[in-house]
Interface confidence: medium
C-alpha cells in the first residue's frame, strides 16, 4: 500500500475556532480500514469516511468542526495490509489563536503595606506573547516578555489586579485577582458548654470572620464570677473549635469566654457564659439492709445515708434494685428508708440491694441481701417478726463479684 | 438502489438470548460503518452502538456497553445486533443506519443516511 | 455520559418561523445534526454537519450552531413539518454518539 497525505502541507496552521480537514489517500488497497493517528493515539471518529476515487484509490476523511488549541499536534494515517501497519507522512497542526493563560494572578491576604508579587503567564501560538499588568483600570506595568512578575511594595485597602497577554492574534485578559487586606480576626460566637461533670467541662464555639489571616488558636478564660480573679487560661490550636476544662471544683459557679488570634494578632473576647459544675454523686452506700417478713410480703429497710459533705447536695430517693433466679427483675424509687416489695416469687432466691441517689446519680450500691426460698418456706414466727437475711457478698459494696452468683450477670446491675 | 433490510418481528421471553439482522444491498457493505438506535414505544431514539465493516471494528454508547453485541459478516453483507439474555426493558423497535457520502466534484462529500424499516422486539413474561 | 437538551415541544402557527434548540457541552467542538421522525415512520436527516441541507429537504429547513446551543429553524413552517425532531452529536472525544430527548413540533 503507498499511503501518502494528499492536498496537506507537512506544515498546517489554522486559527482557533476553524474547521480542518485533513485527507489522506491510500492506493494499492481495494478496502483499506483507514485510521487516524494524533501524537500516537488513534483518534476516535464515529463518522468514519472512506470516499473511493477508483477501485484500488480510497480518501480517508478526519474532520474538526472547530480547532482547539488541543488538537494541535502530529497527524498520521494508517492502515494495516498483510498483517504490517503502513504509516503515512505526518502533518503537523498548529492551532493559532490569541494568548492562553497558564498562570493567572491568585486572590491574595497581606498585611497593610506589606510587599507581596502576582504572577501571570500566557502562551501562543503564535509567539511571542507580551503582558502588560494592570491595577484597577489603571496600566501599572509592560508590555514585558512572558512570563511576567509584578512586584507590589504594598497597599492600604482592597485592590483589584489584572494582566492582559498580546500576540500577533489579538489579546486575552486574565481574571482579576482581588488583594484583600488583612485584619484581626472577629469575636466567636455561639460559645456552648457541651458537657459538664463534677470536674471538668468541654467548650465549643464557632469562630468569627478570621480576617483573611489564618487563625491560630483561640483562648479559653475562666473565672468564678465574670470579671473576678482568672481561675485558668486555656490556649488551644485550631481547629477544631472545642477545648476540656479539667480539674474544675465540683458543684460551682463558674464563667467563661473565649477569644481567637491569626497573625496579627487576638480577636475582642466573646461575651461571658456561665455556666455551674455538678456536684459529686453520693459517696457512702446504704447500711444494714434487712428484710421482714409481712402477710402481704416483704418489707426491706435500711439506715440513712447522711451526705458527706456540701459538693453531694441534698441526697434525693433511694433506688432499690432487685433480681430472681427466674430471671424476673425489676427497680423501685423510695423517698424514704423502707419499702414493701411485691411482685416477687417466695419459692425462688431473692437478691436485693439499694443506692441513695441525687442530682448527679446514684451512689454505690449496697452489700447485696440475698433472701432464700427456703427461709420464707420454713419461716414460722408470728406476723411482722424481724428477721434478717443480711448475706455479705464480697468485701466491697462497689465491686460486682458476678462468679458469686448468676443474678450479677443482669445488665441492670451495671451502673 | 441502497436498501437495508431488517429481520421480522419478534416476541421473546426474559432471560432469552436474540439476534436480529441488517443486510445491507445496492453498495459495497465494508465501506461505510452501520450503526442501531433504539426506540422504546412512545419514546426518543437512543444511539446503542456502531460497527466498521471492513475492520469489525465497533463502538457503543455506555447504557448499552456490555448487554448488546455488535457483528457484521462480510460476506453477506449482514449487521447483527445480539443480546444474550433479554430483559422487559428491551421492548423496543430497533433500526439499523447506515451514512452515505458521495462526491460531487471535489474530494468534500455530501452526506446522505439510510434507515432500515426497523424491527419491533417485544419482551414479555 | 453525555447528554443533549431539547424542549419537549414546541408549537406554531402555519407560515410562522419554529426555532428547535439542542443544547450540549460538546457542541462547540462536535457537530450536531437533526432528524425528523414523523407518527410511525423511521426518521429521516433534516440537516448534517451543523447548517448542511440533507438531500431532499426544503429550503426552508436550516440549521446553525453557536457554542454550545444547535438551532433547528423551519422558516414557514407548513402543516406537513409537524413531527418529532431529535438532533444528535457525538461526545467530546469521539468515543460515542447521542441523540436529544426529542422536541414534538405543532404546527396548529
Known amino acids: 500500500a503507498g499511503l501518502k497525505l494528499m492536498g496537506a502541507p507537512v506544515k498546517l496552521t489554522v486559527s482557533q475556532g476553524q474547521p480542518v480537514k485533513l485527507n489522506c489517500s491510500v492506493e494499492g488497497m481495494e478496502e483499506p480500514d483507514i485510521q487516524w493517528v494524533k501524537d500516537g493515539a488513534v483518534v476516535q471518529n464515529l463518522d468514519q469516511l472512506y470516499i473511493p476515487v477508483s477501485e484500488q484509490h480510497w480518501i480517508g476523511f478526519l474532520s474538526l468542526k472547530s480547532a482547539e488549541r488541543s488538537d494541535a499536534g502530529r497527524y498520521w494515517c494508517q492502515v494495516e495490509d498483510g498483517g504490517e501497519t503502513e504509516i503515512s507522512q505526518p502533518v503537523w497542526l498548529t492551532v493559532e489563536g490569541v494568548p492562553f493563560f497558564t498562570v493567572e494572578p491568585k486572590d491574595l491576604a497581606v498585611p497593610p503595606n506589606a510587599p507581596f508579587q502576582l504572577s501571570c503567564e500566557a502562551v501562543g501560538p503564535p509567539e511571542p506573547v507580551t503582558i502588560v499588568w494592570w491595577r484597577g483600570t489603571t496600566k501599572i506595568g509592560g508590555p514585558a516578555p512572558s512570563p511576567s512578575v509584578l512586584n507590589v511594595t504594598g497597599v492600604t485597602q482592597s485592590t483589584m489586579f489584572s494582566c492582559e497577554a498580546h500576540n500577533l492574534k489579538g489579546l486575552a485578559s486574565s481574571r482579576t485577582a482581588t488583594v484583600h487586606l488583612q485584619a484581626l480576626p472577629a469575636a466567636p460566637f455561639n460559645v456552648t458548654v457541651t458537657k459538664l461533670s463534677s470536674s471538668n467541662a468541654s467548650v465549643a464555639w464557632m469562630p468569627g470572620a478570621d480576617g483573611r489571616a489564618l487563625l491560630q488558636s483561640c483562648t479559653v478564660q475562666v473565672t468564678q464570677a465574670p470579671g473576678g480573679w482568672e481561675v485558668l487560661a486555656v490556649v488551644v490550636p485550631v481547629p477544631p473549635f472545642t477545648c476540656l476544662l479539667r480539674d474544675l471544683v465540683p458543684a460551682t459557679n463558674y464563667s467563661l469566654r473565649v477569644r481567637c488570634a491569626n497573625a496579627l494578632g487576638p480577636s475582642p473576647y466573646a461575651d461571658w457564659v456561665p455556666f455551674q459544675t455538678k456536684g459529686l454523686a453520693p459517696a457512702s452506700a446504704p447500711q444494714n439492709l434487712h428484710a421482714i417478713r409481712t402477710d402481704s410480703g416483704l418489707i426491706l429497710e435500711w439506715e440513712e445515708v447522711i451526705p458527706e459533705g456540701p459538693l453531694e447536695g441534698p441526697l434525693g430517693p433511694y433506688k432499690l434494685s432487685w433480681v430472681q433466679d427466674n430471671g424476673t427483675q425489676d427497680e423501685l424509687t423510695v423517698e424514704g428508708t423502707r419499702a414493701n416489695l411485691t411482685g416477687w416469687d417466695p419459692q425462688k432466691d431473692l437478691i436485693v440491694r439499694v443506692c441513695v441517689s441525687n442530682a448527679v446519680g446514684c451512689g454505690p450500691w449496697s452489700q447485696p441481701l440475698v433472701v432464700s426460698s427456703h427461709d420464707h418456706a420454713g419461716q414460722q414466727g408470728p406476723p411482722h417478726s424481724r428477721t434478717s437475711w443480711l448475706v455479705p457478698r464480697g468485701s466491697s459494696a462497689h465491686h460486682h463479684h458476678h462468679h458469686h452468683h448468676s443474678a450479677w450477670s443482669h445488665p441492670q446491675f451495671e451502673k | 438502489e441502497v436498501q437495508l433490510v431488517q429481520s421480522g418481528a419478534d416476541v421473546k421471553k426474559p432471560g432469552a438470548s436474540l439476534t436480529i439482522s441488517c443486510q445491507a444491498s445496492?453498495?459495497?457493505?465494508?465501506?461505510?460503518?452501520i450503526s442501531w438506535v433504539r426506540q422504546k414505544p412512545g419514546k426518543g431514539l437512543e444511539w446503542m452502538g456502531q460497527?466498521?465493516?471492513?475492520?469489525?471494528?465497533?463502538n457503543y454508547g455506555p447504557s448499552f456497553q456490555g448487554h448488546v453485541t455488535i457483528s457484521a459478516d462480510r460476506s453477506t453483507a449482514t449487521a447483527y445486533l445480539q443480546w444474550r439474555s433479554l430483559e422487559a426493558s428491551d421492548t423496543a423497535m430497533y433500526y439499523c443506519?447506515?451514512?452515505?457520502?458521495?462526491?460531487?466534484?471535489?474530494?468534500?462529500?455530501?452526506?446522505?443516511?439510510?434507515w432500515g424499516p426497523g424491527t419491533l422486539v417485544t419482551v414479555s413474561s | 455520559s453525555y447528554e443533549l437538551t431539547q424542549p419537549p415541544s414546541v408549537s406554531v402557527s402555519p407560515g410562522q418561523t419554529a426555532r428547535i434548540t439542542c443544547s450540549g457541552d460538546a457542541l462547540p467542538k462536535k457537530y450536531a445534526y437533526w432528524y425528523q421522525q414523523k407518527s410511525g415512520q423511521a426518521p429521516v436527516l433534516v440537516i448534517y454537519?451543523?447548517?448542511k441541507r440533507a438531500s431532499g429537504i426544503p429550503e426552508r429547513f436550516s440549521g446553525s450552531s453557536s457554542g454550545t446551543m444547535a438551532t433547528l429553524t423551519i422558516s414557514g413552517a407548513q402543516v406537513e413539518d409537524e413531527a418529532d425532531y431529535y438532533c444528535?452529536?457525538?461526545?467530546?472525544?469521539?468515543?460515542?454518539?447521542?441523540f436529544g430527548g426529542g422536541t414534538k413540533l405543532t404546527v396548529l
Open positions: 460497527i466498521v465493516p471492513r475492520a469489525s471494528r465497533t
Open positions: 454537519e451543523d447548517e
Open positions: 445496492g453498495y459495497t457493505f465494508t465501506d461505510y460503518w
Open positions: 444528535y452529536s457525538q461526545e467530546r472525544n469521539g468515543n460515542y454518539a447521542v
Open positions: 443506519v447506515r451514512p452515505y457520502f458521495q462526491t460531487s466534484g471535489g474530494t468534500i462529500p455530501e452526506y446522505y443516511q439510510h
